[in-house]
């Protein structure tokens, strides 16, 4: 399944919007830094693009879920957040078509499911952190920076797989 060219552009726009959403300096939040344990290997050890796509879909779905809570709405600029939702929604649509097309073509579907579970657990850790920090501005800034990093890593890995094929 070939993702449209606009998908890569969408990923870049998503990162740009995440950067624009920054409200405070991360340097003022150093005491709140946290290692969420991004499961990078779940994107790196999937040798086929068809196996990575459902995991990337899960990643974007979880980002969408995280930023569409009422706590998130209170933390970020509404206009930027709306644009961010639109970009994520478009990417989910692109990937969904590939997920459906790719059903049954993966070498080990259970491996893919374990990867999806690893991504879900990563977002559980992020949600728990926000809850423990009472959704403070610094907590949200730490999470925004973390999502930028992990989203960038996952899309880069997916792009490198695409160029190998």
């Amino acid at each position: 399944c070939d993702l449209p060219q606009t998908h890569s552009l969408g990923s870049r726009r998503t990162l740009m919007l995440l950067a624009q959403m920054r409200r405070i300096s991360l340097f003022s939040c150093l005491k709140d830094r946290h290692d969420f344990g991004f499961p990078q290997e779940e994107f790196g050890n999937q040798f086929q693009k068809a196996e990575t796509i459902p995991v990337l879909h899960e990643m974007i779905q979880q980002i969408f879920n995280l930023f569409s809570t009422k706590d998130s709405s209170a933390a970020w600029d509404e206009t930027l957040l709306d644009k961010f939702y639109t970009e994520l929604y478009q990417q989910l649509n692109d990937l969904e078509a590939c997920v459906i097309q790719g059903v049954g073509v993966t070498e080990t579907p259970l491996m893919k499911e374990d990867s999806i579970l690893a991504v879900r657990k990563y977002f559980q850790r992020i949600t728990l952190y926000l809850k423990e920090k009472k959704y403070s501005p610094c907590a949200w800034e730490v999470v925004r920076a973390e999502i930028m990093r992990s989203f960038s890593l996952s899309t880069n890995l997916q792009e490198s797989l695409r160029s190998k094929e």
């Epitope: 050890n45 999937q46 086929q48 779905q61 049954g104 070498e107 259970l110 374990d114 579970l117 559980q124």
Partner: antibody
């Protein structure tokens, strides 16, 4: 504490349908995959199918396709197995199991279904 | 579908003995991407649901005693109990965790003399 609580025993007439439930506590079903497994008296284990409650995607063993329907309700943290038009072959213990980390790592206590007129 | 053949069907042993049971797959359960064998072992005691013992052919589930060891690669797998205890009386099933439909072996029944 992770637990899967299944509904009670069912006596079903051949051709009628029955819906079994499996309620999770200690975790959110939408973060996992829920499987259903059948075990006939003194027999081995047969995989029926599974659901990803986050999106409703299901997979079935071809032998159960059309005979079993797996659904989930994330608001009540419950997964369901509906058996349609069972025959005496449907008499078995039905287990739900979750894939929280790896493989089927948590199991319900099982629901006994007896198909008899 | 992947077929799993377990042997022997029944094992009768004395407490303290070492036992091994076999599970052979009709096709390789090795994933080339992460070099893991997608074979799982379950233990089912009388009147109880199955319990996960070993996943990825050799990784022991947390809380499982270290007398249980899984080994094997590709199509041939073994579950070893180094020193059988009375509480190990159960049926042991291997399961294909590699591809759908998931399939189970017919089981090996462990009896204590």
């Amino acid at each position: 504490h992770v637990k899967l609580q299944q509904s009670g025993a069912e006596l079903v007439k051949p051709g009628a349908s029955v819906k079994l439930s499996c309620t999770a506590s200690g975790f959110n079903i939408k973060d996992t995959f829920i499987h259903w497994v059948k075990q006939r008296p003194e027999q081995g284990l047969e995989w029926i199918g599974r659901i990803d409650p986050a999106n409703g995607y299901t997979k079935y063993d071809p032998n159960f396709q059309g005979k079993a329907t797996i659904t989930a309700d994330t608001s009540s943290n419950t997964a369901y197995l509906q058996l349609s038009s069972p025959t005496s072959e449907g008499t078995a213990v039905y287990y739900c199991a979750s894939r929280v980390d790896y493989a089927m790592d948590y199991w319900g206590q099982g629901t006994t279904v007896t198909v008899s007129s | 579908d992947i077929e799993l053949t377990q042997s022997p069907a029944t094992l009768s042993v004395t407490a303290g003995e070492k036992v091994t049971m076999s599970c052979k797959s009709s096709q390789s359960l090795l994933n080339s991407g992460n070099q893991k064998n997608y074979l799982t072992w379950y233990q089912q005691k009388p009147g109880q649901p199955p319990k996960l013992l070993i996943y990825w052919a050799s990784t022991r589930e947390s809380g499982v005693p270290d007398r249980f060891t899984g080994s094997g690669y590709g199509t041939d797998f073994t579950l070893t109990i180094s020193s059988v205890q009375a509480e190990d009386l159960a049926v042991y099933y291997c399961q294909n965790d590699y591809s759908y439909p998931l399939t189970f072996g017919a089981g090996t029944k462990l009896e204590i003399k």
